[in-house]
Interface confidence: low
């Protein structure tokens, strides 16, 4: 009977992990001589497996070719990893008495597709905060994944994001890939309580898409508007005055009482109120004594937030040698603020 | 239809070493695509996962018992086991063992053993 | 560890009400989410896969709900052979998580 070599299979798709079957089936056992399995084709192609009893970690034979008629040669490769991709050949040699063994008739080859999970995609941002309307770029990478086919989305508070850039690498042929996204977003005041998502989907997935998150709470800096205000005297030596930071975040917030330009009170927030959009407010009340001051006296509010440039707003009192005055308020278009004491 | 038999002795002496064996029958532990887990339940209290191990190889522990937590599998017998080092009476609990497919849930599981730790 | 806070712990009601049992993630875990039903003596059942998938041979009037960190999960119509502990469980982060379970009784 004619010599024919028949691997049915073109090609096989298996996950990494688990095990597949390369099938070959000889249509006669002569001439005699040994079968093996190849990766590869040329001087450079990789002896896989040989029939010869040797114990090769991964892979078994699927029948028993000790048989006199056994004519199937599949085998068995467990555990598969990514760097097992390739073209699988079974050859046949003809068995050589002094010259070594001669290679008579391959198989058509079977292809396996090793199918990787890719990694879970890591998002990461600017090192530091960006500021509302500022644009910032967050990075998404996922690796170890084969086939190369991949889709990367992004979404920002269930909005998709076109990225400014996706690469997949390396750009040829390879027993795993890479996939690293850039994308754009524009931060706004409103963006403590939002999330940046990268969501991978790959054949592996099984329609659930892996996703890496960036809150944008870690990557945001809301400033505080600060006003001072003067609330009505609780007594006829008492004037109470308020200095109200709205709307900051993070919460590190310091600060600063003056008088006439010298520090009078270090005041540090423990009690900050949370709005809703995620941001902070916090009210510091400033009690004076009125009978201690005769002159005016310039009170300034100062407010450090997230160790940027202290800001300032100053409110000034006028003090009792403005009898004519008594009562009046004046605001000043800087928020310079003028009252008197009684 | 996969089903699952805990085995092992009910009673084990504090310090000594807890031993389990989950068997698989009606399929293949080796066929891919399942996670095998331990999941203990103290007396009247909720469900704790031990650990899972994927029949090629990759085994994953709760890190609150890594460190006395060994979890096997021999294919030839179809089963995988647990091993808890010494253990307390804190060990004291119903020991399930469960296949879980990772978007499939934990849709198979063992009837539990239970097994108190006394001298 | 991502910590999964289920409420009420223990409910009571009639039967043919419609049930409700919240389960919330310490961090947000996409759809990673099962529901197992356990009655007395018993080893766990799943009912609920991936948040809202009913398990085969599960009955229609159990449902599931919810993504990121809320989860819901609902009886329709409460039947006698209901009466069991209801867990939640995440696989989104190692370690695998349950919440603390709810104990649903008939009135």
């Known amino acids: 009977k004619e010599l024919k070599v028949t691997q049915p299979e073109k090609s096989v798709s298996v996950a990494a992990g688990d095990s597949t079957v390369l099938n070959c089936t000889l249509t006669s056992l002569l001439p005699v001589g040994p079968i093996r399995w190849y990766r590869g084709v040329g001087p450079s192609r990789l002896l896989i497996y040989s029939f010869a009893g040797e114990y090769v970690p991964r892979i078994r034979n699927v029948s028993d070719t000790t048989k006199r008629n056994n004519m199937d040669f599949s085998i068995r490769i467990s555990n598969v990893t990514p760097a097992d991709a390739g073209i699988y050949y079974c050859v046949k040699f003809q068995k050589g008495s002094s010259e070594p063994d001669t290679e008579i008739q391959s198989g058509g080859g079977t292809e396996v597709y090793v199918l990787a999970k890719p990694s879970p995609p890591e998002v990461s941002g600017p090192a530091d905060r960006g500021i509302p309307d500022q644009k910032v770029n967050f990075t998404c990478k996922s690796h170890g994944f084969s086939p190369r086919n991949i889709t990367l989305k992004w979404f920002k508070d269930g909005q998709e994001l076109h990225p400014l850039e996706t690469t997949v690498n390396p750009s040829g042929k390879n027993v795993s890939y890479n996939i690293s996204s850039t994308v754009r977003v524009v931060l706004n005041s409103m963006d403590v309580n939002s999330k940046v998502i990268c969501e991978v989907a790959h054949i592996t997935l099984d329609r659930s898409p892996l996703r890496g998150i960036a809150n944008l709470s870690n990557f945001i800096r809301v400033s505080p508007t600060v006003k001072v205000t003067q609330q009505s005297p609780t007594s006829m030596n008492q004037v109470n005055l308020t200095c109200r930071a709205e709307r900051f975040y993070p919460e590190d917030l310091q600060l600063i009482w003056l008088e006439n330009g010298n520090v009078s009170r270090n005041d540090t927030p423990k009690n900050l109120t949370k709005n809703t959009d995620g941001t902070y407010n916090y009210t510091s009340l400033f009690l004076v004594n009125s009978s201690a001051h005769r002159e005016d006296v310039v009170f300034t509010c100062q407010v450090k937030h997230d160790q940027q440039p202290a800001i300032t707003r100053n409110h000034t009192v006028l003090g009792f040698a403005h009898s004519s005055d008594q009562g009046s308020m004046q605001t000043f278009p800087d928020n310079n603020a003028t009252h008197n004491w009684n | 239809q996969v089903q699952l038999q805990e085995s092992g002795p009910g009673l084990v002496k504090p310090s000594q070493t807890l031993s389990l064996t989950c068997t698989v029958s009606?399929?293949?532990?080796?066929?891919?695509?399942?996670?095998w887990s331990w999941i203990r339940q103290h007396p009247g209290k909720g469900l704790e996962w031990i650990g899972a191990i994927y029949y090629s190889g990759p085994i994953y522990y709760n890190p609150s018992l890594k460190s006395r937590v060994t979890i096997s599998v021999d294919t030839s017998k179809n089963q995988f086991s647990l091993k808890l080092s010494s253990v307390t009476a804190a060990d004291t609990a119903v020991y399930y063992c469960s296949k879980e497919g990772y978007h499939s849930g934990m849709d198979v599981w063992g009837q539990g053993t239970t097994v108190t730790v006394s001298s | 560890d991502i910590q999964m806070t289920q409420s009420p712990s223990s409910l009571s009601a009639s039967v043919g009400d419609r049930v409700t049992i919240t389960c919330q993630a310490s961090d947000d875990i996409s759809d990673y989410l099962n529901w197992y039903q356990q009655k007395p003596g018993k080893a766990p059942k799943l009912l609920i896969y991936?948040?809202?998938n009913l398990e085969t041979g599960v009955p229609s009037r159990f449902s599931g709900s919810g993504s990121g960190t809320d989860f819901t999960f609902t009886i329709s119509s409460l039947q006698p052979e209901d009466i069991a502990t209801y867990y939640c469980?995440?696989?989104?982060?190692?370690?695998?998580?349950f919440g603390g379970g709810t104990k649903v009784e008939i009135k």
């Open positions: 009606g399929g293949s532990i080796s066929s891919g695509g399942y996670y």
């Open positions: 469980q995440q696989f989104a982060y190692l370690p695998w998580t």
């Open positions: 991936d948040a809202s």
